[in-house]
Interface confidence: low
């Protein structure tokens, strides 16, 4: 006869490990006893349990409540045992010794491998700002046994680099994702993907990118200068920009205070019925925590009663300042 077993038994941390040992013999042969031992290079052979054909399972005190027989029905030639709730300390070599009648004794060894699934964590990098060079967007760390694989899933262009730290019973892998921040990345997902043989499916942690930026400012409302005539109602100037964080808007007049009745409402400057007093240079100031930008326009209010007055071209200029 011979023993049927496995060279390597692999389980996930906390699972029950089935240590297989089946005697394949002639029809008239019987298994009297199976002795299980842990073979440790430092501590030598330690008894785990005795499985007797008549008296059943007798577990060594060191493994009490941890070793069981597989659930019935059980073949009398099956000497397999279950090691409950495998932990990393259970990793190592195990031996089954089978005493048969009349063929004698057989023995086999197997290695128990305990997979420790990683518990990944994602740490965002420093705040991202448009205009920075290559910058850390996020790092992802996962520790397990064996070493997990840590990669990134994203549409964003960037570079990833990994490093490993090996501990006595596990390995920690950290992967960093670097990118050159641009506003198009704002709101884009950056997903850390952790693969490991102890996981049924990859573990994924998603970080949403936030890139601080501030667009150039421009002013809308002066497209048709002829509309800016004395007496017109509802005239407005609207400041256009975008940014992250969302910018704040402010309006001033370059050549003095805002005329009476001119109202600032966020990005919009609202005028009362126009008079020539509303002519002047208006400045829209846009700012967020990253920087600030200005756009100025010249408003010329035309008086239809003064036909000799020529229409001036509207001029605009833009400035920006970084904080």
């Amino acid at each position: 006869g011979e023993l049927e077993t496995s060279d390597v038994v692999t389980v996930v941390l906390g699972q029950d490990a089935k240590l297989p040992c089946f005697y394949r013999g002639d029809p008239d042969e019987q298994v009297g006893q199976v002795a299980w031992a842990r073979v440790d290079p430092n501590e030598g052979i330690r008894e785990l349990a005795l499985l007797h054909s008549k008296y059943g399972l007798h577990v060594n005190p060191a493994y009490e409540d941890r070793v069981e027989q597989p659930p019935p029905p059980r073949d009398p030639l099956d000497g397999s045992v279950l090691l409950r709730n495998a932990v990393q300390a259970d990793e190592g070599e195990y031996e089954c010794r089978v005493s048969t009648f009349p063929a004698g004794s057989f023995q086999a060894r197997m290695r128990l491998r305990v997979l420790v699934p990683p518990l990944p964590s994602l740490n965002p990098g420093p705040p991202l700002e448009e205009g920075q060079g290559l910058t850390l967007a996020a790092s992802c760390t996962a520790e397990g046994s064996p070493a997990p694989s840590v990669t990134w899933d994203t549409e964003v262009k960037g570079t990833q680099s990994s490093r490993s730290f090996t501990h006595p019973r596990s390995a920690a892998v950290t992967s960093e994702f670097h990118l050159v921040p641009s506003r198009s990345m704002n709101g884009q997902p950056l997903t850390c993907v952790v693969s490991h043989p102890g996981l049924l499916q990859d573990r994924r942690i998603t970080h949403t990118l936030q890139v601080a930026f501030l667009a150039e400012a421009s002013v809308r409302g002066l497209e048709d200068q002829n509309l800016w005539q004395v007496g017109r109602e509802g005239a407005t100037l609207k400041c256009l920009s975008e940014g992250q964080p969302p910018p704040k808007y402010n309006w001033t007049r370059l050549d003095g205070p805002l005329p009476s009745g001119v109202r600032v409402k966020g990005d919009t400057l609202g005028f009362p019925p126009l008079t020539t007093e509303h002519s002047g240079v208006y400045v829209c100031h846009v700012s967020n925590e990253l920087s600030s930008r200005d756009s100025q326009v010249t408003v010329e209010v035309l008086d239809p009663e003064d036909p000799g007055k020529q229409v001036d071209l509207v001029s605009a200029s833009h400035h920006h300042h970084h904080h």
């Epitope: 941390l13 906390g14 409540d65 941890r66 409950r84 709730n85 932990v87 518990l119 990944p120 964590s121 994602l122 740490n123 965002p124 760390t141």
Partner: antibody, heavy 120, light 107 residues
Framework: EVQLLESGGGVVQPGRSLRLSCAAS????????MHWVRQAPGKGLEWVAV????????YYADSVKGRFTISRDNSKNTLYLQMNSLRAEDTAVYYC?????????????WGQGTLVTVSS | DIVMTQSPSSLSASVGDRVTITCRAS??????LAWYQQKPGKVPKLLIY???TLQSGVPSRFSGSGSGTDFTLTISSLQPEDVATYYC?????????FGQGTKVEIK
Amino acid sequence: EVQLLESGGGVVQPGRSLRLSCAASGFTFSSYGMHWVRQAPGKGLEWVAVISYDGSNKYYADSVKGRFTISRDNSKNTLYLQMNSLRAEDTAVYYCAKDYGYNWNFFDYWGQGTLVTVSS
Amino acid sequence: DIVMTQSPSSLSASVGDRVTITCRASQGISNYLAWYQQKPGKVPKLLIYAASTLQSGVPSRFSGSGSGTDFTLTISSLQPEDVATYYCQKYNSAPYTFGQGTKVEIK
């Protein structure tokens, strides 16, 4: 559904003993570390003790070391805290808490707590 | 032993406000930090572990960050149901101590 139910609290005189129990259900009790955490009236949380999934390893806060003993009976799905030489400062609600894994040592489920009052 | 210190000890904010609570360890603990929420008269609830990993079922307005000694719990938009005391806890080695707690109230 994971359930943890503490019992054994009450009023006790200083220097006396008390034994708390925590009955667990809804998960494989023998696969998880278990902890005791306490909270004095109107105060914050204080970790007291942990026992490994199999009872082989135990750790205690300095404030209870030598006086309290944590134990478990996996066949009964029950966690215990034997409290000896009780002091007034041991007055608190005692929670049993399930470890997130076999020894991560943070807690994903808590019992409702049992009040221990040490007073003469 | 490592001491965990939270700040502020209490705060009052309006619904919709961004709320930030910090937790500092007296020695580095890598990212072995958990955050718990305890509503008045209730048992603590796990919010975040590994410093920044959101526990299943916790609303996404909660987030955590930090590593080493300095950690932050952020509520991006405070809701009335977020009134509670929040605790940090380190779990790299025994004793598994908590911060003293931060009480969050609505203005």
